[in-house]
């Protein structure tokens, strides 16, 4: 689609005549008619295919004509066409006299004509304006004309259509050859898909307008490269959405149980070594002087009873000192000055003479230790019992009391509350310092995950790649329905 | 009113020549162009060419190139058909008609000229 | 040279209905979205009459009865309704290449 235009600029009849040579009375009353046709070897009569227009009077005899004076009001003429322009043309440019007002053909005198041209040729689409000039015997004829496409036609032949658009179609202006250019921020054939941020990972995330980065389900930040970990996931880390890839010293479906509670939470105090005992527990050793579960408790250098033979201990800032019975001496009061004859063993012991009469020894009962079998035996001096267990001295042994979740002659096992299996369908169980958690599936919760609940199965957006996620109710498990060109029970594989 | 009026009927000898006038008048003689056309006795329509009246540009049917010539006089407003080496299949009515470039057709016709060829 | 093929050759017609004549070329007489075909009445012992040009456009004087459609090598001439005074010869002809070339005619008669 496209406009032939023809601009008339001068037209010279200097002697006032009609083309049979007899002069117009008073003169020529010009007007023009144009026929624009198919290209013809010989112009030849027939339709004017291209089109034809025609202008009111433009001047007598001789006369420039004016920029926009012809055509009803416009120079130059416009003679448009709605098919490709085939690059040649045949002209035909009639100058007629009208003596009236009336230019209809049967209005006007049988010898009317003042001058005929006929010209063909090629003429390519452009801007430029071709001058030409025709003369006959009687006239002349100054005017230019070129072919330019319509609004929104491009191309050698105004054949392209391409109108510029800025909308949901497409976002582009037209090329002078019609070929599109797409605004910036978008890209593709029309122009209607947005370049996303720079870096928004191609698969991950997408966007609706430009420099826009929209994550797809299990995918977060700025560039859509952080993949959201399990719901819940305390101390763990995804390399794809959903994942809960516990840290060091971290177990468990959520990653929140501690199996490095030493290292966490350094609980043993006053220097004493900690060592890991599964989850959540631990033993403290303390150095000497320290004791209690976490070390915590400084010992008085007596309370190891250090004095013998009935001695009693003071604590001192250095140290302690033994105050001695009568017949003993020494440091710990370990030396006697007493012999069997002094009847010093005490609670049924026996006393033995030694280097000849000068030292004894007591033999003592089961029960009684000391020098002097002045003590009662404390098999829990040592604090045998690991895990806070209580020792208790039942006669010739001892026993531990454990605390709860522990077990063995040293409470120094840990009993599962979680071996007898205490969550229901399908519940994972926790072992806690004071009983267990249960971690309960979707649909089900209470203590021990046997209360049923309705849930969404989609409520995670579990499907990739903008897959439609639907919840089987009988199961209340999801199921991906996948776009083309993806594949998985969670739609995570481009096919190929 | 428009009228193209011919020359009167004529009666030749094979291989003779002969020249058919038509007169126009009601118009402007040299924005037109001037068709010839054929009827032999009972049959159809044939073309034999056109001239335009304007600058004599002719266009010729190549069944009848070499045996016609066409010609205006624009001072009386007159067209001409010679045809020449006549035979006895050149025995026909002979028209002109008019026609302009912006296509109406041939609307106006002249009534006719009998030619006869015989020996 | 493009053939016109006219049909049917002859036809009776009573008055008042409607006569429908074909034409059909060798090859299409479009060009640039124009149909070159023209149509004419010939009576006896006149000369041609011009009745459609342009397949469809009516000519100068003619009746409204006659209407003429078509394009690229398909036409016809409708005449409705029939008139005593529309018995005659009726041709097409084609005037989109050197030689312009004429139908063989259809005689139109009353029933």
């Known amino acids: 689609s496209g406009v032939f235009q023809l601009q008339l600029q001068e037209f010279i009849n200097e002697r006032g005549v009609l083309a049979s040579g007899r002069p117009c009375e008073p003169g020529c009353r010009t007007f023009f008619r144009v026929c624009l046709k198919h290209f013809q070897a010989v112009v030849s009569p027939g339709p004017c295919t291209f089109g034809t227009v025609s202008t009111p009077v433009l001047g007598t005899n001789s006369f420039a004509v004016r920029d926009d004076s012809s055509g009803g009001g416009r120079n130059p003429l416009q003679l448009p066409f709605n098919f490709t322009w085939p690059g040649t043309f045949s002209l035909i440019i009639e100058a007629w006299h009208a003596p009236g007002d009336d230019l209809r053909p049967e209005a006007l005198p049988p010898d009317a004509l003042i001058s005929k041209i006929a010209i063909q040729g090629s003429l390519a689409v452009g801007q430029n304006w071709l001058l030409d000039e025709q003369t006959s015997t009687l006239t002349r004829l100054r005017y230019s004309y070129r072919v330019i496409c319509s609004d929104n036609y491009y191309g050698d032949n105004c054949s392209r259509l391409c109108k510029k658009r800025n909308d949901h179609f497409g976002h582009y202006v037209c090329q002078p050859d019609g070929n599109l250019s797409c605004l910036p921020g978008w890209t593709g054939e029309y122009c209607q898909q947005p370049i996303c941020l720079s870096g928004c990972h191609e698969q991950n995330g997408y966007c609706s307008k430009p420099a826009e980065c929209l994550c797809r389900p299990g995918w977060q930040g700025r560039l859509c490269n952080e993949c959201i970990p399990h719901n819940g996931c305390r101390h763990g880390t995804c390399s794809t959405p959903w994942q809960c890839t516990c840290d060091e010293g971290w177990g468990g479906l959520f990653c929140d149980q501690d199996l490095n509670y030493c290292t966490h939470h350094s609980p043993c105090k006053n220097g004493a070594t900690c060592s890991n005992s599964g989850q959540r527990s631990y033993t403290c050793t303390c150095r000497p002087g320290y004791t209690g579960v976490d070390c915590e408790l400084e010992l008085s250098e007596c309370d190891s009873n250090p004095c013998r033979n009935g001695g009693s201990c003071k604590d001192q800032e250095d140290g302690y000192h033994c105050l001695c019975p009568p017949g003993y001496y020494g440091l710990h009061c370990e030396h006697s000055t007493l012999s069997c004859a002094d009847s010093p063993c005490f609670n049924g012991g026996s006393c033995r003479e030694r280097n000849q009469g000068a030292n004894y020894a007591c033999e003592c009962p089961p029960n009684f230790t000391g020098s002097n079998c002045e003590k009662k035996v404390d098999r829990c001096t040592s604090n045998p019992c690991a895990n806070g267990g209580q020792c208790l001295n039942r006669g010739p042994s001892r026993m531990c009391r454990c605390r709860p979740g522990f077990t063995g002659t040293y409470c120094e096992l840990h009993v599962s509350d979680c071996a007898r299996n205490p969550c229901a369908h399908g519940g994972t169980c926790h072992d806690l310092e004071n009983g267990l958690m249960c971690t309960c599936p979707a649909g089900f919760s209470g203590r021990r995950c046997e209360v049923r609940t309705s849930i969404d199965a989609c409520a995670s957006s579990p499907c990739f790649n903008r897959a439609t996620c639907y919840t089987d109710l009988s199961t209340d498990t999801f199921v991906c329905n996948c776009p083309y060109g993806f594949v998985g029970s969670r739609c995570e594989f481009p096919v190929g | 009113q428009v009228q193209l009026v011919q020359s009167g009927a004529e009666v030749k000898k094979p291989g003779a020549s002969v020249k058919i006038s038509c007169k126009a008048s009601g118009y402007s003689f040299t924005a037109y162009y001037i068709h010839w056309v054929k009827q032999a006795p009972g049959q159809g329509l044939e073309w034999i060419g056109y001239?335009?009246?304007?600058?004599?540009?002719?266009n010729y049917n190549q069944k009848f190139k070499g045996r016609v010539t066409f010609t205006t006089d624009t001072s009386t407003s007159t067209a001409y058909m010679e045809l020449r080496s006549l035979r006895s299949d050149d025995t026909a009515v002979y028209y002109c008609a008019r026609d302009y470039d912006y296509d109406v057709g041939m609307d106006y016709w002249g009534q006719g000229t009998l030619v006869t060829v015989s020996s | 040279d493009i053939v016109l093929t006219q049909s049917p050759a002859s036809l009776a017609v009573s008055l008042g209905q409607r006569a429908t004549i074909s034409c059909r070329a060798s090859?299409?007489?479009?060009?640039?979205?124009?149909?070159?075909m023209k149509w004419f009445q010939q009576k006896p012992g006149q000369p041609p009459k011009l009745l459609i040009y342009?397949?469809?456009n009516q000519g100068s004087g003619v009746p409204a009865r006659f209407s003429g459609s078509g394009s690229g090598t398909d036409f016809s001439l409708n005449i409705h309704p029939m008139e005593e005074d529309d018995t005659a010869m009726y041709f097409c002809?084609?005037?989109?290449?050197?030689?312009?070339?004429f139908g063989g005619g259809t005689k139109l008669e009353i029933k």
């Open positions: 002809q084609q005037s989109k290449e050197v030689p312009w070339t």
């Open positions: 342009a397949a469809s």
């Open positions: 001239i335009s009246c304007y600058n004599g540009a002719t």
């Open positions: 090859e299409s007489v479009d060009n640039y979205g124009i149909s070159f």
